[in-house]
């Protein structure tokens, strides 16, 4: 027999066995040109000393073979003795070590058997009623196909599925969607209506994440506020990575879960932008403000569950950094300025009303004054901090106020609003005999003492009404009692108390008269 022809004789070996695990597999035969044909197959097992024979039986009942040696691919023409217009059955017999192994057969019309391509290029993946929908452009001149898919998870082997017949310029497939594990899909096609024709190769892997992105399990820590008024947010625990099927472990797109950090600055609500989303890898610096932080997981199907934390405001206060002067025209704050053209956000809130919204003012970008200070003023009519109560004041600064992560804390302090001099006057001053020449003076704490760092000291004044002699006694802001000594019996005295701040002398309390009774001896 000529090598280019199919030999119509009995093959030169004994009967074959098709039951072994090794042997020829996946035979596919198709037309490659107007008169040219090709068959190819896989061989599993040791290849040394294996000879392959492509067998063919015609509709006439005659059978022939091509001897291909060690090759697992054969090309032949329509003149090779194989009928290409009628149905034929083809299979491979592989002979080695005195035994022959046989492939499954294919029965087809060679002329109609066109080598179909798998889905090529971009396979679009979407979710449809709890299922996975894949869609792709039909390869050129190959409209009319039967399509199969296979899929696996990280822990399962391939499972085969059917997409059904396709007859359009775009083809699609509905596949099962897993809730909590990633899947790898591959698709293949063959000519519609020719059951014996060969399947295309499998497509490149399509990697599909689980329907539910995993709950992000992460932990944060916040560093101390630095001298620059910023503190670093650091990730203590990375989110766990999704387990992937074998074909998706490289840089296969589509299966990845992205984690984003959503930052919401709760302080200073009058600024331009309160929320910023950034990749989890870019851990930001924060001001000393309070924030809500959310980690949002998302995949190609959209966002999944998120995890939210509250980062409380840094409560460290600078009692001396802020200067407040109250004049007839209004009130002005002064503080050490930052760089040129800095925007400041001044926020204040009555102490004890932290749940309510803070009052907030944004300055126009300002440069430091000649003394290196920044200022903010308001008129008395505005009513700002006009009530006689303690306010917590925080000042934030940014050269780029629209960029949430570029704000820093300038200072955080307390201020007593309204007429602090009068409001701070101590009440309920009482005098009690202490000994023969001393008394104990007590008073109710000044309202200023509710304002951390505001009350500098109490001053107790004692006047001898006989001699008009006056003595003043400074008292620590934490004390509300003092002992006056070296007093004379029978002399009338008046006592008054005032509360002073760093920048303001308080008003004296109502004079309280007392005297020590003369002791009469028996």
């Amino acid at each position: 027999c000529r090598t280019s022809e199919c030999c119509f004789q009995d093959p030169p070996y004994s009967d074959a066995d098709s039951g072994s695990a090794s042997g020829p597999r996946d035979l596919s035969c198709y037309r490659i040109s107007s008169a040219g044909y090709e068959c190819s197959w896989q061989y599993e097992g040791p290849t040394a000393g294996v000879s392959h024979f492509l067998r063919c039986c015609l509709s006439s009942g005659r059978c022939c073979y091509f001897a291909t040696g060690s090759a697992t691919r054969l090309q032949f023409s329509d003149q090779a003795g194989v009928s290409v217009l009628h149905t034929v059955t083809l299979w491979v017999e592989s002979w080695a070590r005195n035994r022959t192994e046989k492939s499954p057969e294919v029965t087809l019309q060679l002329y109609k058997s066109v080598k179909y391509k798998p889905p090529l290029g971009d396979i679009k993946v979407s979710k449809l009623a709890g299922q996975l929908r894949m869609e792709w452009e039909t390869p050129d001149n190959q409209v009319g196909a039967e399509v199969q898919f296979r899929h696996r998870t990280p822990s399962s082997s391939w499972k085969l599925g059917d997409c059904g017949p396709q007859d359009d310029d775009t083809e699609s497939c509905l596949c099962p969607l897993e809730m909590n594990v990633a899947q790898e899909f591959q698709l293949r096609r063959r000519r519609l209506g020719s059951q014996g024709s060969s399947w295309s190769k499998w497509s490149s892997p399509v990697c599909v994440p689980p329907e539910n992105p995993p709950q992000p399990q992460v932990r944060f820590s916040v560093e101390q506020l630095g001298r620059d008024g910023r503190r670093r947010l650091t990730l203590k625990e990375q989110p766990t990575q999704l387990e992937l099927p074998e074909g998706c472990q490289g840089p296969a797109p589509g299966v990845e879960v992205t984690y984003q950090l959503q930052l919401h600055m709760l302080s200073c609500p009058c600024k331009a932008k309160a929320t910023r989303t950034l990749p989890l890898e870019k851990m930001p610096y924060l001001s000393g403000a309070a924030y809500n932080v959310a980690v949002i997981s998302s995949n190609r199907f959209g966002p999944g569950p998120n995890q939210t934390w509250h980062i409380p405001a840094d409560t460290h206060t600078e009692p001396v950094a802020l200067n407040i002067s109250v004049g007839t025209n209004g009130t002005t704050m002064y503080w050490p300025a930052r760089a040129q053209s800095t925007t400041y956000c001044i926020e204040w809130q009555p102490v004890g009303q932290e749940g309510s919204l803070a009052t907030c003012n944004l300055t126009a970008p300002q440069d430091p004054d000649p003394a290196g200070m920044a200022t903010y003023s308001w008129s008395r009519e505005s009513g700002a901090m006009g009530q006689e109560k303690c306010y917590h004041i925080t000042i934030f600064a940014s050269a780029h106020p629209k960029k949430l992560t570029l704000w820093s804390t300038v200072l955080s302090t307390y201020h007593f609003g309204g007429n602090a001099s009068a409001a701070g006057t101590p009440h309920h001053v009482s005098v009690k005999n202490h000994s023969l020449d001393s008394v104990s003076v007590d008073w109710a704490p000044s309202l200023l003492s509710t304002c951390p760092g505001v009350l500098k000291e109490y001053v107790v004044r004692c006047r001898d009404e006989d001699s008009n002699q006056v003595s003043e006694h400074p008292v620590q802001p934490t004390e509300t009692q003092v002992t006056l000594s070296d007093l004379r019996a029978g002399v009338a005295y008046t006592v008054q108390v005032r509360a002073d701040t760093a920048w303001l002398r308080g008003a004296w309390s109502q004079p309280q008269r007392f005297s020590i009774k003369v002791q009469v001896s028996d």
Epitope: S18, C57, P104, T107
Partner: nanobody, 123 residues
């Protein structure tokens, strides 16, 4: 040498069903194509159905299409012919045959043959 033994024949009323079995002795039966033929007295053997060794290809005579089904169980070295909606014209001796080749049509020469089993369909 492959030895084939048919069983399952018998008498059945028109419209009824029978299942024929063809058991083989050879270990390499799973690499053989198997066909069923039938013969009535004074006539040539007539092709009924065939199945490839993998079970992936089957072929039927026009006269039995839609009524008969050929299948195989390679683990048991057996091929079956399920015959439904039987007609009196299906009365014949049914033979199974085996060959290393699978023929894609009714034509083909089979190397090994069984002794046959009688199927009678009464009206």
């Amino acid at each position: 040498q492959v030895q084939l033994v048919e069983s399952g024949g018998g008498l059945v009323q028109a419209g009824g069903s029978l299942r024929l079995s063809c058991a083989a002795s050879a270990r390499i039966f799973n690499s053989y194509a198997v066909a069923w033929f039938r013969q009535t007295p004074g006539k040539e053997r007539e092709f009924v159905a065939s199945i490839s060794w993998s079970g992936g290809s089957t072929n039927y005579a026009d006269s039995v299409k839609g009524r008969f089904t050929i299948s195989r169980d390679n683990a048991k070295n057996t091929v079956f012919l399920q015959m439904n909606s039987l007609k009196p014209a299906d009365t014949a001796v049914y033979y199974c045959a085996a060959d290393r080749n699978y023929y894609p049509s009714v034509l083909g020469k089979y190397t090994y043959w069984g002794q046959g089993t009688q199927v009678t369909v009464s009206s």
